[in-house]
């Protein structure tokens, strides 16, 4: 079974998008990853964690180039989500240098709710997206990005913070989720897996992608992050899945080519400003949206998540560079830095397009199972 690439979704046609023949099932990243020895039981095995909120960050978008993928999430095959029993957990460890338990990590003890009680909240991120259950919401208009095409100077800080690689963004990157829903981009970071093991945070019908980018934004209603944490809509994250394609992605290469310089935890370097929107899919009109949390402690809720339907394509070499260059705490590779998916607990994911409509000949009358709740709010 292949993941169809739809030619009409490819903005420039050609390049790494527009493939008509589907990928074989064997090409899909396995959800049944074998556990690492050091990994504790799955999150779902930890008491009181089934409601944990998640965290994440990353904003910005613009029309994509030939390097961007045209895979649409609604075209993915249905896969039973196995529950991620062997995936990295919401766990923290006691720092070597003291009692402080705030130095959390992926995999280890104690569980994240002990680090931050909010991590045991009911509306956490990431989640599994099931397009058939998404509520089509025509009021969700195309995202608007302004000022994302940065000049080379001033340079930007690229840091290995031990959990991810983070690019700090300058003032002036404006993003609107809709009328009156305006944000400023703060930073972007990535989540990835390891060799042969996908590492996106969100999943689609149980399918985990190789990697995921998050652009984190702060609502213009707040001056600073500390004021916005936990407030509904205070933070917004734009998320996009990264997939393997046949060509090198030149936008990502501007960052990936510098990772060796920051291989050590805590290292940072300065990189020339770049077109941040080139790191995102080109189709700003088709996306999923829901309210969740940060995917790392303190797991503050109220975060508006926007997950693009279109994916971004990187070469196999680039994905390998991403997952195999950086080092994290305790002389361990910085890999598999994703949180397990969290229960929706009654939340309905909204879609800006009719993702759940079955247009196949079998369906005499397409049915959308959920309706849009936020009619223009």
């Amino acid at each position: 079974q292949r993941l169809p690439r739809m030619q009409e979704d490819s903005p420039l046609g050609g390049g790494s998008s527009g493939e008509d023949d589907p990928l074989g099932e064997e090409d899909l990243p396995s959800e049944e990853d074998s556990p690492r020895e050091e990994d504790p039981p799955g999150e779902e095995d930890l008491p009181g964690e089934e409601d944990l909120p998640g965290e994440e960050d990353l904003p910005e978008v613009k029309p994509k180039s030939e390097e961007e993928g045209s895979l649409k999430l609604e075209d993915l095959p249905t896969v039973e989500a196995p529950g991620d029993p062997q995936e990295p957990q919401n766990n923290a460890h006691r720092d070597k240098e003291g009692d402080d338990q705030s130095h959390w990590r992926y995999g280890g003890d104690p569980p994240w709710p002990r680090v931050s009680p909010a991590c045991a909240g009911r509306f956490q991120s990431p989640v599994d997206i099931r397009p058939q259950l998404a509520a089509f919401c025509p009021a969700l208009r195309p995202l608007e990005l302004l000022g994302f095409q940065l000049p080379p100077l001033p340079e930007l800080r690229l840091r290995n913070n031990g959990h991810s690689v983070q690019l700090t963004l300058p003032p002036g990157l404006e993003m609107a989720l809709g009328p009156g829903r305006e944000y400023r981009a703060l930073q972007l970071h990535l989540h990835w897996g390891a060799a042969g093991r996908p590492g996106s945070e969100h999943t689609v019908e149980g399918h985990r992608f190789p990697a995921e980018i998050h652009v984190v934004h702060l609502s213009t209603a707040f001056a600073r992050v500390d004021e916005a944490l936990g407030r509904p809509g205070g933070l917004a994250v734009l998320a996009a899945f990264l997939e393997e394609g046949p060509e090198e992605n030149s936008a990502y290469e501007q960052l990936l080519s510098r990772l060796e310089e920051i291989a050590e935890e805590g290292s940072e370097t300065q990189v020339p400003g770049l077109d941040i929107s080139a790191l995102l899919p080109s189709d700003f009109s088709r996306y999923f949206q829901y309210e969740g949390s940060l995917t790392t402690p303190p797991c503050a809720q109220g975060v508006i998540w926007t997950v693009f339907n279109q994916t971004v394509m990187l070469s196999a070499k680039q994905l390998h560079t991403l997952s195999d260059t950086l080092w994290g705490p305790g002389d361990s590779r910085l890999q598999l830095n994703f949180r397990a998916t969290q229960p929706l607990n009654g939340r309905v994911i909204e879609a800006s397009f009719p993702a759940g409509v079955d247009s196949s000949p079998r369906a005499a009358e397409p049915v959308q199972l959920n309706s849009c709740l936020a009619a223009g709010d």
């Epitope: 402080d100 913070n161 700090t168 303190p298 994290g328 705490p329």
Partner: nanobody
């Protein structure tokens, strides 16, 4: 809102020691313990450079020029960042800034360190 205030700077002779402190106030409890914290410095006519950092994952990293002489530490209970500076050299003269990085950067106003005989 979070505010950072450095203290401990001053004039010291080469070979001497200073201990810089940075206190976070305001809503810092919301973010401090989950942030990467760092000290940067800026000498006249030069770019701001990283001196030392403790990442949100707990690792420490020092610039080559201060390794073995400076020690960074944090006290999450008191929301403070410390920089113990030993064997100071004239080239350590700069304005020192503390930084808290949690989704966005928070900066102090800086404290002057002058190493001179």
């Amino acid at each position: 809102q979070v505010q950072l205030q450095e203290s401990g700077g001053g004039l010291v002779q080469p070979g001497g020691s200073l201990r810089l402190s940075c206190a976070a106030s305001g809503n810092s409890a919301n973010i401090f313990s989950f942030a990467s914290v760092a000290w940067y410095r800026q000498a006249p006519g030069k770019q701001r450079e990283l001196v030392a950092v403790i990442t949100s994952a707990g690792g420490t990293k020092y610039s080559d020029s201060v390794k073995g002489r400076f020690t960074i530490s944090r006290d999450n209970a008191k929301n403070t960042i410390l920089l113990q500076m030993n064997s100071l050299k004239p080239e350590d003269t700069a304005v020192y800034y503390c930084n808290v990085d949690y989704l966005q950067d928070y900066w102090g106003q800086g404290t002057q360190v002058t190493v001179s005989s």
